[in-house]
Interface confidence: medium
């Protein structure tokens, strides 16, 4: 099943994000990704831990998951590096780094995104976009097209709380807000992007969706910075 | 609960044969590759053979030492993962161990083995 | 064959010591997709073995952040930074990337 958790948005300009990518695993959407390099995608760790045996590929210029695009390109995965200190049963260092099995082509539909390399909070209140293929209601509708919602980034004090997150958003994760608009199951892995710039990537626990106490969870890619250069390289 | 249970081991003579089974539950059996791996009494692991899933084509690896002599099957639809061990010779005594493998290529479920003594 | 040398055989330590347990591959075990398919495995007295880390240095679910894997190519090592008693057991490192896939001899991890 997919994993994460695009409430309360909307469908996205068809190719506008061409860094986003659908991970697959037999054909099917498990989660989101974003392209950071040629041959690169970033994704959440824990989208993997149910593949299995399966076939996993990597979806890029796509805008719709079912319909015959001319950007349209799927590609094997040659490597994948999960965070090495990733676990099943944690939030923490919850990234994937997917090697294609060749670059990718690139053209206005399909582009890598640039990450934050500075390690520094984004401001509370910044609306960041995510976008995805997860669920889009909480009867589980799972949309063909990409969507996307603006949230506000909430600051790590008020997520700590002990009515939200009680104290388990490290600095190396951050916030934003979920009141009825929030990432959702099948989410997970995806981009959230402020200033044009990825700033965090979509964790894949199982929290609900939507809730206002339970905001949405995205690793700082800027904390990641040296992990993901090192692969990178 | 996710486990492995394996059965048929037992007593056999030099150049008999036996169908050992892994009777699998708690997991999507036929989404993994699953592994036989035995060890021999006082020694180390040593891996025998790995099947890997339908969307696979159910490719088989084995050990060089029993390549030709040992075949490994599954039955999804039973969740069963069977090794039949063909003209065993003394050194295939050991406790053989089901093991399914995880995405990253791990062995993350073992079972708590069964003997198989070759002997005259 | 790809042949995994393991050292020491045993390993004398005292609770809350450091333990070190090297591995070395008769050649490199970078798979053609780029992983290192190295694992460790612990295997306590009258138990199925149980994983610890994969591809080198990914600790598994569970297990405890004192358990850490490095190394690349042919060299690695597996380190315990504070041994404890439920740590005493036999460690085996194991390549997946070669075909026949093959494991250590064991080390033997045990109190001075």
């Known amino acids: 099943p997919p994993r994460g958790r695009i409430l309360g948005g909307r469908e996205a300009e068809a190719h506008a994000r061409p860094y986003m990518a659908s991970v697959q695993l037999n054909g099917a959407h498990l989660c989101g990704g974003v392209l950071v390099a040629e041959q690169w995608v970033l994704s959440a760790a824990h989208c993997l831990e149910d593949a299995a045996d399966g076939k996993v590929q990597v979806l890029l210029g796509a805008h719709s998951l079912s319909q015959p695009e001319p950007s349209k390109r799927l590609y094997d995965v040659l490597r994948a590096v999960p965070h090495p200190d990733s676990q099943p049963d944690t939030i923490d260092h919850d990234l994937l780094l997917l090697q294609l099995s060749e670059k990718a082509t690139l053209g206005p539909a399909v582009r890598p995104l640039p990450w934050q390399r500075v390690d520094r909070d984004v401001a509370p209140g910044t609306l960041c976009d995510v976008a995805g293929w997860g669920i889009v209601n909480h009867a589980g509708r799972r949309p063909d097209s990409l969507q996307h919602v603006l949230l506000p980034v909430l600051d790590r004090a008020t997520c700590n709380r002990r009515t939200h997150h009680d104290g388990a958003i490290t600095e190396r994760l951050m916030c934003a807000e979920s009141n009825r608009r929030d990432s959702c199951k099948g989410d997970s892995g995806g981009p959230l992007v402020c200033g044009g710039v990825l700033e965090g990537v979509v964790t894949s626990g199982s929290r609900v969706c939507g809730n206002r106490k339970k905001p949405g969870i995205y690793t700082r890619v800027a904390s990641y910075a040296a992990w993901i250069d090192s692969v990178l390289a | 609960e996710v486990q492995v249970v394996e059965s048929g081991g037992g007593l056999v003579r030099p150049k008999g044969s036996l169908k050992l089974s892994c009777a699998a539950s708690?997991?999507?059996?036929?989404?993994?590759?699953m592994n036989w791996v035995r060890q021999a009494p006082g020694k180390g692991l040593e891996w025998v053979a790995r099947i890997r899933s339908k969307s696979n084509n159910y490719a088989t690896y084995y050990a060089d030492s029993v390549k030709d002599r040992f075949t490994i099957s599954r039955d999804d639809s039973e969740s069963m993962l069977s090794l039949q061990m063909n003209n065993l010779k003394t050194e295939d005594t050991a406790m053989y161990y089901c093991?399914?493998?995880?995405?990253?290529?791990?062995?993350?479920?073992w079972g708590t083995g069964t003997t198989v003594t070759v002997s005259s | 064959d790809v042949l995994m040398t393991q050292t020491p055989l045993s390993l004398p330590v005292s609770l809350g010591d450091q333990a070190s347990i090297s591995c070395r591959s008769s050649?490199?075990?970078?798979?053609?997709?780029?992983?290192?398919?190295l694992e460790w495995y612990l295997q306590k007295p009258g138990q199925s073995p149980k994983l610890l880390i994969y591809t080198v240095s990914n600790r598994f679910s569970g297990v405890p952040d004192r358990f850490r894997g490095s190394g690349s190519g042919t060299d690695f090592t597996l380190k315990i930074s504070r041994v404890e008693a439920e740590d005493l057991g036999v460690y085996y490192c194991f390549q997946g990337s070669h075909v026949p896939w093959t494991f250590g001899g064991g080390t033997k991890l045990e109190i001075k």
């Open positions: 093991v399914r493998q995880g995405y990253y290529w791990y062995f993350d479920v």
């Open positions: 708690g997991f999507s059996f036929n989404t993994y590759a």
């Open positions: 050649q490199s075990i970078v798979h053609s997709n780029g992983n290192t398919y």
